[in-house]
């Protein structure tokens, strides 16, 4: 059965997924999709990486961690009840039937009504919002939260570690800058460069 994750309407939801690159920079293509993982690919792709970069994403979905170290956890911005459901993280390891796939269930709860405005700490506070706008144009700088260099022995959702407050502090204190590729295509809602 799927591992369950929760967020409130209006918050950012975080769905963890990790793998260990065979060597630094030796990345594996990954896709995220809405719906349970089918036999190949991801049901309805919302984001994907190739061997080098994030090469396709749709609005509100991004990778806040250091995907170059194998943190391909998905952040969904400003969730609504419609974002509830199963999401697929697929690590597309080359070879014969080598893919690793994970189904993660996202449960969205209605927002709590609070009497006075207070600083909300949602469960994704450990994963800082990007400090500059996302890559809608050529070579635009994006500042992302990155995972500390922890030892990931195998692909895992690492749910326990992510609930660890020390990790949360490390994440809040770290940052990484990634340049948006100049051949991203911006069509409002979908952003990609071709995979060839």
């Amino acid at each position: 059965s799927e591992v369950e994750y929760r967020a409130e309407v209006g918050q950012n939801a975080y769905l963890p997924c990790f793998y260990t690159p065979a060597a630094p920079g030796n990345l594996v293509p990954v896709c995220w999709g809405k719906g349970a993982c089918p036999v190949f690919e991801c049901g309805n792709v919302v984001l994907r990486t190739d061997e080098r970069d994030v090469n396709y994403w749709t609005s509100r979905y991004w990778l806040n961690g250091d995907f170059r170290k194998g943190d391909v956890s998905l952040t969904i911005e400003n969730v609504t009840l419609a974002d509830s459901g199963i999401y697929c993280c697929r690590i597309q390891i080359p070879g014969i039937m080598n893919d690793e796939k994970f189904n993660l269930k996202l449960v969205i709860k209605p927002a709590k009504v609070t009497p006075a405005p207070t600083r909300q700490r949602d469960f994704t506070a450990a994963f800082p919002r990007m400090l500059t706008t996302r890559g809608h144009g050529p070579a635009e700088t994006q500042t992302l939260g990155s995972l500390p260099d922890i030892n990931l022995t195998q692909i895992s959702t690492l749910a326990n570690e992510l609930r660890d407050s020390r990790l949360a502090n490390d994440l809040r204190d770290s940052g990484a800058t990634i340049r948006g590729s100049s051949d991203y295509k911006d069509d409002d809602d979908k952003h990609h460069h071709h995979h060839h």
Epitope: P38, V39, E41, G43, M97, D99
Partner: antibody, heavy 122, light 107 residues
């Protein structure tokens, strides 16, 4: 117009080899997973193998993966199936089919070739 | 492996009839189900994908429903060209598997 044309079938003795080819046209070949599906005479459909966009990942029916190899050449818009150590039970029409695309979503074999008959007999 | 079981195996019906073919998966396949039509000596033709989405160029008298383990293909008003064999197929687990087929014959 999407077109898939298989070739390479024929009569082969048990233990022999054949290489099937599928020429694709009318779509961006490298944007799609491709598959081979077979149908023995008077029988139902049986999936054989799939291959991803660039050929780096392959998927097989367990009982065939030691003898069959799926591959593709995106520069030639071609899909292949190398069949070794053929047996009488491999006798079938072999179809090439287009599977899911780069952005997912549509799970079904949307286009099929006309098929090529492989007969394994002494 | 996920087994796909179609029923009935064969069916006799008349032009204008409403026909329903069912397909049951041995495990949850969500909505990753396709339906195909095959005529003798021809390649299969995709009718429905993702359990209920009509493939391009397929007449609206064909419809699909279901999710999880139980699925249905319905032909609302049989036409002469609809007499053929119909297969369901799952795209959720490896290996991909087909139902054994339902032969639709003229009564």
């Amino acid at each position: 117009e999407v077109k898939l044309v298989e070739s390479g079938g024929g009569l082969v003795q048990p233990g022999g080899s054949l290489r099937l080819s599928c020429a694709a046209s009318g779509f961006t070949f490298s944007d799609y997973y491709m598959a081979w599906v077979r149908q023995a005479p008077g029988k139902g459909l049986e999936w054989v193998a799939n291959i991803n966009y660039d050929g780096s990942s392959t998927y097989y029916l367990d009982s065939l993966k030691s003898r069959f190899t799926i591959s593709r050449d995106n520069a030639k818009n071609s899909l292949y199936l190398q069949m070794n150590s053929l047996r009488a039970e491999d006798t079938a029409v072999y179809y090439c089919a287009r599977d899911v695309g780069y952005y997912g979503g549509n799970y079904g074999f949307a286009y099929w070739g006309q098929g090529t008959l492989v007969t394994v007999s002494s | 492996d996920i087994q796909m079981t179609q029923s009935p195996s064969s069916l006799s019906a008349s032009v204008g009839d409403r026909v329903t073919i069912t397909c049951r998966a041995s495990d949850n396949i969500y909505s990753y189900l396709a339906w195909y039509q095959q005529k003798p000596g021809k390649a299969p033709k995709l009718l429905i994908y993702n359990a209920k989405t009509l493939a391009e160029g397929v007449p609206s008298r064909f419809s699909g429903s279901g999710s999880g383990t139980d699925f249905t293909l319905t032909i609302s008003s049989l036409q002469p060209e609809d007499f053929a064999t119909y297969y369901c197929q799952q795209h959720y687990g490896s290996p991909l598997t087909f139902g054994q087929g339902t032969k639709l014959e003229i009564k």
